[in-house]
């Protein structure tokens, strides 16, 4: 008789999971040789333990904090970027911008980017075939923790001046419900940052409101003042020139406003 | 082979200063980490600092950061500790490391000896 | 006090297996590789085992280590009397941003 095996609506754990974040480990020591030492087969151990095991809508921060003690690698806190709805933009930019850091760009972020997993109550398997939705089955998945987990240690390590990348072409450019909104805008540190700043990202080429004037952006800047951050935000109106002009600041055509 | 030469060591009063050097040949110094490692007499191994390749990053053990400041100079194959502040508890054997991949100190120096002594 | 807690001594007769433990946390041992390192009077530190388990090449496979947790051993088999020798451990430090050595194992061959 086969167990009956609960059916999540989310897509299942990536296939070779366990594989895929072993191998990414190893490499991002390889890439940056300031993790030379870090032993990858213990990060998989202590990654494994906060899921396997364990009901899939139960796990809690608590459940990654062996893992979180790998944390403290050293990203300068004033060269923090964090982002919303616009990930890919943001990647190119810190590919560029070296000396600037997404959460992704951290070990624990670059580990998990764009993964799914999840395990089983009381079985040691992996559960390959449907992990819980977010909205549909329970917010206290292993991958909506995990993430909360680290982007809120991530905001709380930042300094001085931190941005942020939004998407202007989306209807809300600022999301309360993101990750930005929910979790990292509250554990920004104002005894430690002094301004967020915000670069809103025109979508389309002819587009050239002041998005910066958005009542979503009015909203997090209210957000932002209440907690004694300043705020301050700036329009890219064309991203294809904004990273160009990343890559050769020197061009002439970079003086004007991108 | 690999050498790590290590010079610079003596005799100094509390307070004053120091420069050890060490010259590397047998391998492509710059593309390696290198370290400083002391042994105080009757005592075990202690890491003093390292310095990283590339666009150097250093390292420091809490009993020596603020005083001592590890550099390197590629183009002479030459790795330095310049100590200030010396103390009495400083005397120790320095020996310079080559730093391996997985952050292993894979070769030494003999090391040189500095006695901080009034 | 080191970061790492290692036997202050150890002995076996020739030919016997010695192991060698060293404790340490999550900070250090827990997610970084371990490191094994010999050390004769008078002479420049041996690596001897790098990456918790690996020997470099000229070291022989006498010298075996292992990892576990926060914790690490190395073990000595077919002890020899030119093995007699003081051995640390070492593992990068994360609360630390450096390198910590264990206080050391003196191994006598009696």
């Known amino acids: 008789v086969p167990r009956w095996r609960q059916q999540w609506s989310g897509p299942g754990t990536t296939k070779r999971f366990p594989e895929t974040v072993l191998a990414r480990c190893v490499k991002y020591t390889e890439i940056h040789p300031e993790m030379r030492h870090v032993d990858c087969q213990s990060v998989w151990d202590a990654f494994k333990g906060a899921f396997i095991s364990k009901h899939p809508c139960n796990i809690t921060e608590e459940d990654y904090q062996p893992l979180m003690k790998l944390g403290t690698q050293t990203v300068p806190c004033n060269k923090i970027l964090l982002w919303s709805r616009i990930k890919d933009l943001a990647h190119q930019f810190t590919q560029v911008q070296r000396d600037m850091f997404t959460l992704e760009d951290t070990l624990l972020g670059y580990l998990a980017d764009d993964l799914t997993w999840c395990g089983e109550f009381n079985t040691s398997k992996i559960n390959y075939q449907s992990c819980p939705d977010w909205r549909k089955d329970c917010s206290n998945n292993p991958v909506s923790v995990f993430w909360k987990t680290v982007s809120r240690r991530f905001a709380e390590a930042a300094c001085d001046v931190v941005h942020v990348m939004l998407n202007g072409s989306r209807s809300k450019i600022f999301d309360k419900n993101s990750t930005f909104g929910s979790v990292e805008v509250h554990n920004l540190q104002p005894e430690k940052v002094q301004t967020l700043e915000a670069w809103v990202i025109h979508g389309g080429r002819e587009d050239s409101r002041d998005l910066c004037q958005d009542p979503t952006i009015k909203e997090l800047e209210s957000i932002i003042s209440k907690r004694n951050i300043q705020f301050s935000c700036k329009n890219i109106y064309r991203p294809d020139k904004f990273l160009q002009c990343v890559k050769n600041p020197e061009d002439s055509s970079c003086t004007s406003e991108i | 082979q690999v050498q790590l030469v290590e010079s610079g060591g003596g005799l100094v009063k509390p307070g004053g200063s120091l420069r050890l050097s060490c010259a590397a040949s047998g391998f492509t110094f710059s593309d390696d980490y290198m370290s400083w490692i002391r042994q105080a007499p009757g005592k075990g191994l202690e890491w003093v600092a390292s310095?990283?390749?590339?666009?150097?990053?250093?390292y420091y053990a809490d009993s020596v950061r603020g005083r001592f400041t590890i550099s390197r100079d590629n183009a002479k194959n030459s790795l330095y500790l310049q100590m200030n502040s010396l103390r009495a508890e400083d005397t120790a054997v320095y020996y310079c490391?080559?730093?391996?991949?997985?952050?292993?100190?894979?070769?030494w120096g003999q090391g040189t000896l500095v006695t901080v002594s009034s | 006090q080191s970061a790492l807690t290692q036997p202050p001594s150890a002995s076996g007769t020739s030919g016997q297996r010695v192991t060698i433990s060293c404790s340490g946390s999550s900070s250090n041992i827990g997610f970084h590789f371990v490191y094994w390192y010999q050390h004769l009077p008078g002479t420049a530190p041996k690596l001897l085992i790098y990456?918790?388990?690996q020997r470099p090449s000229g070291v022989p496979d006498r010298f075996s280590g292992s990892k576990s947790g926060n914790s690490a051993s190395l073990a000595i088999s077919g002890l020899r009397s030119e093995d007699e020798a003081d051995y640390y451990c070492?593992?990068?430090?994360?609360?630390?941003?450096?390198?910590?050595f264990g206080s050391g194992t003196k191994v006598t061959v009696l």
């Open positions: 310095v990283s390749n590339g666009r150097p990053t250093t």
């Open positions: 490391a080559r730093e391996g991949w997985s952050g292993e100190f894979t070769d």
């Open positions: 990456k918790n388990n």
């Open positions: 070492a593992a990068w430090d994360d609360s630390l941003s450096g390198y910590v």
